[in-house]
Interface confidence: low
Amino acid sequence: ESWEPCVEVVPNITYQCMELNFYKIPDNLPFSTKNLDLSFNPLRHLGSYSFFSFPELQVLDLSRCEIQTIEDGAYQSLSHLSTLILTGNPIQSLALGAFSGLSSLQKLVAVETNLASLENFPIGHLKTLKELNVAHNLIQSFKLPEYFSNLTNLEHLDLSSNKIQSIYCTDLRVLHQMPLLNLSLDLSLNPMNFIQPGAFKEIRLHKLTLRNNFDSLNVMKTCIQGLAGLEVHRLVLGEFRNEGNLEKFDKSALEGLCNLTIEEFRLAYLDYYLDDIIDLFNCLTNVSSFSLVSVTIERVKDFSYNFGWQHLELVNCKFGQFPTLKLKSLKRLTFTSNKGGNAFSEVDLPSLEFLDLSRNGLSFKGCCSQSDFGTTSLKYLDLSFNGVITMSSNFLGLEQLEHLDFQHSNLKQMSEFSVFLSLRNLIYLDISHTHTRVAFNGIFNGLSSLEVLKMAGNSFQENFLPDIFTELRNLTFLDLSQCQLEQLSPTAFNSLSSLQVLNMSHNNFFSLDTFPYKCLNSLQVLDYSLNHIMTSKKQELQHFPSSLAFLNLTQNDFACTCEHQSFLQWIKDQRQLLVEVERMECATPSDKQGMPVLSLNITCQMNKTIIGVSVLSVLVVSVVAVLVYKFYFHLMLLAGCIKYGRGENIYDAFVIYSSQDEDWVRNELVKNLEEGVPPFQLCLHYRDFIPGVAIAANIIHEGFHKSRKVIVVVSQHFIQSRWCIFEYEIAQTWQFLSSRAGIIFIVLQKVEKTLLRQQVELYRLLSRNTYLEWEDSVLGRHIFWRRLRKALLDGKSWNPEGTVGTGCNWQEATSI
Amino acid sequence: QKQYWVCNSSDASISYTYCDKMQYPISINVNPCIELKGSKGLLHIFYIPRRDLKQLYFNLYITVNTMNLPKRKEVICRGSDDDYSFCRALKGETVNTTISFSFKGIKFSKGKYKCVVEAISGSPEEMLFCLEFVILHQPNSN
């Protein structure tokens, strides 16, 4: 190509010619070039009109080009140049007109260019200059030359890493002539030992940075006194970890700041063990913004009401413990990436609106309500990248919240109540990667204004997406990626008429169905990449909403066979929606593996008779299989009854219960029956089932056949568990087949009638039979245990060794 | 691949090779040399970066006797008011810095430790350099 050996980054605009051993400016690049990087080439000398071939140039990088001389008019043709970078050039001769013609220059970087003085630097005519970086040079005097009065747009002057030792009143005289200047000045890493008092009197700066300027505490105090009279919007003091630091530092260090007018203060890197860091800041009670970055705060009394700060920032600091914060006027608190103080303790910040507590490894033992933060004004709360956060309140008093971020923290008790019920103003919610297991359909109740919901990297009960979004009518963005989802409710998205972006990628869907998306009138992006989609759920796939513009089906397991021909054809019909079609490849059959789905032509013809016979055969086999499957366990039970006959019962009872009632079974049932008199022996799946044998076989052979009775622990959890109901149905068959058998019902908690009616048989049985009801009172317990023992004693021969157990959670635990 | 020797200590020998095509020169001195049983000292680096060091971070890939540990990301420069003065270094500017280090010893088993250090900086992010350090550890050597 014509531009080689340079690299074309943006055609006709940006070219990178770095380190190509050029001795002269290349002449094979387009006239239209706007960005040109010629760094690390041995150009050595720039003559007049060096860049006449590039009249459109806006950014020119000449770093480390060994340039020693720059002649008059070297850049003469570059009237559009806005950025000129000369870093690392050992300039010895700089003509007075070196920078002439640069009528639009806004940024000049002359770092490490052997510059000894600003006085002789020929930039007085650069009226458009906004940023001048002359750091890492040999400048000894801070005297700002008279030509600075021409630089009325100057915003940044970087004089760091020079040789400035003293600042005198006369040095800044020119700034008095420029009262409207909004200048940020960096003087870090200059070996300062004297600032003449009054030098900064009545000077206004936007920002002043002084880091690693002083070699002793006394020098620091004297120099800060010398800043008296300065009005600065933002003052940054501190040190650097890799530079020589002061030997000592105490609370008197910043006393001189009382004579400055400061709007925002930041202390950056300080590694001293101070008795009480708060005493340092007596002169900073009235700044509006206060920041500590990389400061060691082992002991701190508290940040208390005397401070009038509106914004407090504590970043990358080391704390002995979480600080006590009680600041009446504070509106913004940023407390991020800190170490130590792992347990959040309450703060009292009545005016707080913005709170960022991210990346601290904090544990939070009762989130979240107004009392935690001492405010009802909070609009923004970021608790991301922390430790365990236990939800124990649904944001009472925090109804103003609009932004809430928990990502990559470990949320607990999320499915126990409607955590977000109060947050009707919330617009943004991120609970991605929070170990949340959605087992409660009301999880998002209350979020009527929510527009963005990110919940990637969590999981759902039975890997099924239920109707949890019914109240989120304003949702525009929903991320459900990496949630191990396998199925979704057909009506899961029915209320999301405003949804524009839906990310379902990185799940375990095996088929695609358009039906759930029929109500998404605003949907523009649907991402189903990185699933296992082979085919469609239904024979006939409908169209996606007409608003859809991007459909991502890349990296799925497409089955490119005749039986899926209609699905593959449907995919081709969606071609205009599909993104990255080249990454949509066949996974099966093996001879087509890796082939692009859209370029495939499958010809599929078959004899109609063969199809008819096949379909009929499949139907017959299916019906038989279904019947066998449906009654398989009942048949197995019957076979067992015949085989075992009236064999010896090892257990007094086999207990069926929901794993969610395990505490009660272990702590109450087990304790009282196993350790009582007489002791009863109960069949427990985890103790008495034989490892390696199928669960169903264990239930029937170990549970039913070897037990005299069955105890059924009925509760809300029990009714809602398919596995418990399955066991209960087997128990009924067992009772029917075995004349001696008996089922003892224990109702653990009042079960809603409507729930119970869903299980008609159980409802009838409980209506007709006497059952035991657990009542947690002294008298109630006494009666309960007496009746239960009586029921179990029926037909029991005395056996002094007793153990107690359970039956249903084996399956439930793995399936939920 | 040319091996660059860094130093020897009572229990370790440290060297590095480049793991990128660029192989821009970098000078690394450790004084006194790191002892894995625990030591403190000064790390001196001389380097002329090919990009600004703003937002510099390291990706560390550590191998212990052929066993790979998970990738570790170490952020060195956040982008404003950073801890290290070299974070403000620009492309082509000499970085000549001394960083003090100290660490309490961990009991390392004898063997060969490899650490690939990928330095990434700038916006947009690009690789600055890549070095593969090899540490031969002989716990009982003098």
């Epitope: 508290d302 208390s304 413990q321 347990a343 033992k365 009762g366 365990v388 | -």
Partner: antibody
């Protein structure tokens, strides 16, 4: 119901060490802080420190740093206080108490106390 | 550390009388807890976070205060209220108790 059961009284010699236990029932110690408090005759209550069993984290009043060590074993739902280099000043009743977020980490349940007597 | 000073250190009250125990802090705290300890028993939580009554505590007890001054009031003293009362702050490390007020019933 919530209970904290402390180990029995201890008579120890000066210079020795003692380890007191506090076994919780009715709640999981991982969900709370466990505090230890000292009560000497004719003195008020003195806070020794707390442990956060979930994060294996303990914090001490500087006066007890080096003297007391608080640990917890979540498997047995038990917290421990170990006191070293005992002197007559350490003769006191030591209480464990639960700090629970439902009452803003106030100590809502207390053990019955363990009397430690240091005497030669 | 924050020093909590309780006054009076000993107080004598008649049955049915209203009394107030005070607790002053050497510097501002966010809130105060109060405990009651009867002779030979463990302390018992009375008031948490300045004014919230702990469960099972009679309504004759109430708390108030802010900043450096907090108080516990018993509206109508009963014989069973004879005990030591301690204030306790948990908002600034290290967490401290007051020296206690001993309430005697005449």
């Amino acid at each position: 119901q919530v209970q904290l059961q402390q180990s029995g009284a201890d008579l120890v010699r000066p210079g020795a060490l003692v380890k007191l236990s506090c076994t919780a029932s009715g709640f999981n110690i991982k969900d709370s802080y466990i505090h230890w408090v000292k009560k000497r005759p004719e003195w008020g209550l003195e806070w020794i420190g707390w442990t956060d069993p979930e994060n294996v984290n303990s914090i001490y009043d500087p006066r007890f740093q080096g003297k007391a060590s608080i640990t917890a074993d979540t498997s047995s739902n038990t917290a421990f206080l170990q006191l070293t280099s005992l002197t007559s000043e350490d003769t006191a009743v030591y209480y464990c108490a639960r700090g629970y977020n439902g009452v803003y980490y106030a100590m809502d349940y207390w053990g019955q106390g363990t009397t430690v007597t240091v005497s030669s | 550390q924050i020093v909590l000073t309780q006054s009076p250190s000993i107080m004598s009250a008649s049955l049915g009388e209203e009394i107030t125990l005070t607790c002053s802090a050497s510097s501002s705290v966010i809130y105060m807890h109060w405990y009651q300890q009867k002779s030979g028993t463990s302390p018992k939580l009375l008031i948490y976070r300045t004014y919230n009554l702990a469960s099972g505590v009679p309504s004759r007890f109430s708390g108030s205060g802010s900043g450096t001054f907090y108080s516990l009031t018993i509206s109508s003293v009963e014989a069973e209220d004879a005990a030591d009362y301690y204030c306790h702050q948990w908002s600034s490390f290290p967490y401290t108790f007051g020296g206690g007020t001993k309430l005697e019933i005449k």
